[in-house]
């Protein structure tokens, strides 16, 4: 339904509070370096303008598209060229090219200072002094660091952030109340950002068809009692929501997400028996709850898949009539029967089925040709099963930190050209799959592990895309979305790599390491491990583990010393010398 004024329409649908929050998120995700105050000023100007359009939809400029209005506003920033360089050239373009240009300049790894958490009393004072500014600042800081964060979900995080401060700033022990809540929000926020980044990469790099296939598989697992037509409708709507959010259309996205939640709750009887509790919640909680809802029970007595997709004489006829619909039905039927499979595995099976039909439906005897297609699935299913079994055994044997170290070594040897911070970040996240998924029973391990690994490997892909240094990473990231993980798993040691020059400074440590948190200390040690592998890619795992143990002993010894700095200087030199002599650094 067309509206005379799109901005008025969205303001009325969303309400002033959500409208302002979403515009702030949109602007911060585009202009990631701009100061908070500048963004607040722009948002206030847009909001005042929107109010004039609500009062009179025929008022001047009210008929302009949101991209035009927002883009014009962003292009008024005086320091655009000095701060953003070539991004300023976007302002010379017309819509829709201008918005596309802004999107292309979103930076997944912006050069911004790490967010340092102030003392609890300082935060509580700031919260009480100006709650609105405090919460806006949260939205701004998260949005500019995570330019693809799912905006309506960020509103939900902000609501929880506010609730945490409201409760804990009145508590007897403010820190004991607040800090665990903030830690939880930070960890959930990082996970949410990474999951959404994969959705946007899927849409932007592989197209709508790839995203829809993913959504069919995931929603069919979640809602196995729903009819195919119902799942298809949900997929279409969900694709629209994510296309909008990934495209920077945050007002439309939030509005459509609310409509989708409303539809799901109004039709829960034909969708899932697990939605009742979600649908009793307020909007933001409701949408979040639906997105995380557990899989419904599978209908009893589902017939064998073979009848419709292998044995039927109409397979090729049905396929030829509507290829994507037929493949969608195959994916729906397979996924609803297999909540124990990862979405990416289901998509690999569907791709194998599609390739077989493409070949066989052109053959002399199609049925004879595709009769054994399900046999081709066996190795595809067994590969992730075996990999997860081996890695969970390794995780249980080593614990998370040492499991991360094993992965650091593995991935540094595969792609040593990748920057050390990226290798550390990605390998640490890959290593978290152990504590996240290995505790689950067999039936839940694969969807947990392989779909999580897809999210983490996408982080590697988007970070690498910014500054490409490895053809092998580019190849695994771009050839096939669903085969990224098998592609990286299959990479062996890069024999073409020329070891990095030895630099003593890389292995020089100071007393400040003693005051770091356990996590930060681990990162320091893991950074040294990656550098060591880059210097000595042929080092055995025994040698690398030995150096790490020496390093741990050295840090422990010097952190106990009276003169810590002298100890780090002298013992550090000795450790480097011993390692150099033993490994020939």
């Amino acid at each position: 339904d067309a509206h005379k004024s799109e901005v008025a329409h969205r303001f009325k649908d969303l309400g002033e509070e959500n409208f302002k929050a979403l515009v702030l998120i949109a602007f911060a995700q585009y202009l990631q370096q701009c100061p908070f105050e500048d963004h607040v000023k722009l948002v206030n100007e847009v909001t005042e303008f929107a109010k004039t359009c609500v009062a009179d939809e025929s008022a001047e400029n009210c008929d302009k598209s949101l991209h035009t209005l927002f883009g014009d506003k962003l292009c008024t920033v005086a320091t655009l060229r000095e701060t953003y360089g070539e991004m300023a050239d976007c302002c010379a373009k017309q819509e829709p090219e201008r918005n596309e240009c802004f999107l292309q300049h979103k930076d997944d790894n912006p050069n911004l200072p790490r967010l340092v958490r102030p003392e609890v009393d300082v935060m509580c004072t700031a919260f009480h002094d100006n709650e609105e500014t405090f919460l806006k600042k949260y939205l701004y800081e998260i949005a500019r660091r995570h330019p693809y964060f799912y905006a309506p979900e960020l509103l939900f995080f902000a609501k929880r952030y506010k609730a945490a401060f409201t409760e804990c700033c009145q508590a007897a022990d403010k820190a004991a109340c607040l800090l665990p809540k903030l830690d939880e929000l930070r960890d959930e926020g990082k996970a949410s950002s990474a999951k959404q980044r994969l959705k946007c990469a899927s849409l932007q790099k592989f197209g709508e068809r790839a995203f829809k296939a993913w959504a069919v598989a995931r929603l069919s697992q979640r809602f196995p009692k729903a009819e195919f037509a119902e799942v298809s409708k949900l997929v279409t709507d969900l694709t629209k929501v994510h296309t909008e959010c990934c495209h920077g259309d945050l007002l439309e996205c939030a509005d459509d997400r609310a409509d989708l939640a409303k539809y799901i709750c109004e039709n829960q009887d034909s969708i899932s028996s697990k939605l009742k509790e979600c649908c009793e919640k307020p909007l933001l909680e409701k949408s979040h709850c639906i997105a995380e809802v557990e899989n419904d029970e599978m209908p009893a007595d589902l017939p064998s898949l073979a009848a419709d997709f292998v044995e039927s004489k109409d397979v090729c006829k049905n396929y030829a009539e509507a290829k994507d619909v037929f493949l969608g039905m195959f994916l729906y039927e397979y996924a609803r029967r297999h909540p124990d499979y990862s979405v990416v595995l289901l998509l690999r099976l569907a791709k194998t089925y599609e390739t077989t039909l493409e070949k066989c439906c052109a053959a002399a005897d199609p049925h004879e040709c595709y009769a054994k297609v399900f046999d081709e699935f066996k190795p595809l299913v067994e590969e992730p099963q075996n990999l997860i079994k081996q890695n969970c055994e390794l995780f249980e044997q080593l614990g998370e930190y040492k499991f991360q170290n094993a992965l650091l070594v593995r991935y540094t040897k595969k792609v040593p050209q990748v920057s050390t911070p990226t290798l550390v970040e990605v390998s640490r996240n890959l290593g978290k799959v152990g504590s996240k998924c290995c505790k689950h029973p067999e039936a839940k391990r694969m969807p947990c592990a392989e779909d999580y690994l897809s999210v983490v490997l996408n982080q590697l892909c988007v970070l690498h895309e910014k500054t490409p240094v490895s053809d092998r990473v580019t190849k695994c990231c771009t050839e096939s979305l669903v085969n990224r993980r098998p592609c990286f798993s299959a990479l062996e040691v890069d024999e073409t790599y020329v070891p990095k020059e030895f630099n003593a400074e890389t292995f020089t440590f100071h007393a400040d390491i003693c005051t770091l948190s356990e996590k930060e200390r681990q990162i320091k040690k893991q950074t040294a491990l990656v550098e060591l592998v880059k210097h000595k890619p042929k080092a055995t795992k025994e040698q690398l583990k030995a150096v790490m143990d020496d390093f741990a002993a050295f840090v422990e010894k010097c952190c106990k010393a009276d003169d810590k700095e002298t100890c780090f200087a002298e013992e550090g030199k000795k450790l480097v010398a011993a390692s150099q002599a033993a490994l020939g650094l």
Epitope: T540, E542, Q543, K545, A546, V547, D549, D550, A552, A553, E556, L575, A578, S579, A581, A582, L583
Partner: nanobody, 123 residues
Framework: QVQLVESGGGLVQAGGSLRLSCAAS????????IGWFRQAPGKAREFVAR????????DYADSVKGRFTISRDNAKNTVYLQMNSLKPEDTAVYYC????????????????WGEGTQVTVSS
Amino acid sequence: QVQLVESGGGLVQAGGSLRLSCAASGRTFSSYAIGWFRQAPGKAREFVARVSTIAGDTDYADSVKGRFTISRDNAKNTVYLQMNSLKPEDTAVYYCAADSYNVRLVTGEADYWGEGTQVTVSS
């Protein structure tokens, strides 16, 4: 200076167990990483297992993982190698070695070595 003396070797049937000991002299025993190596007739000396100075961090050669266990008792200045499910290919002279650095230990460049103890596994 650290002196190392191995004991506990002998003849055992395949599938059997032995416990080797490495007794060390010296007050600063706990600040040394200790390892076991072995050398079969006509073969190069190979790393078997080691125990680090801190937190008893251990590491094993793939060939003995799950069968051998290394441990240290700093109060007794002794390191043990518990060898279970022994195989004929475990037959060798077993040496104890010590160094301030694990990395020198695993590369076979340790400062201190014992005389060795013979382990023979018959089939």
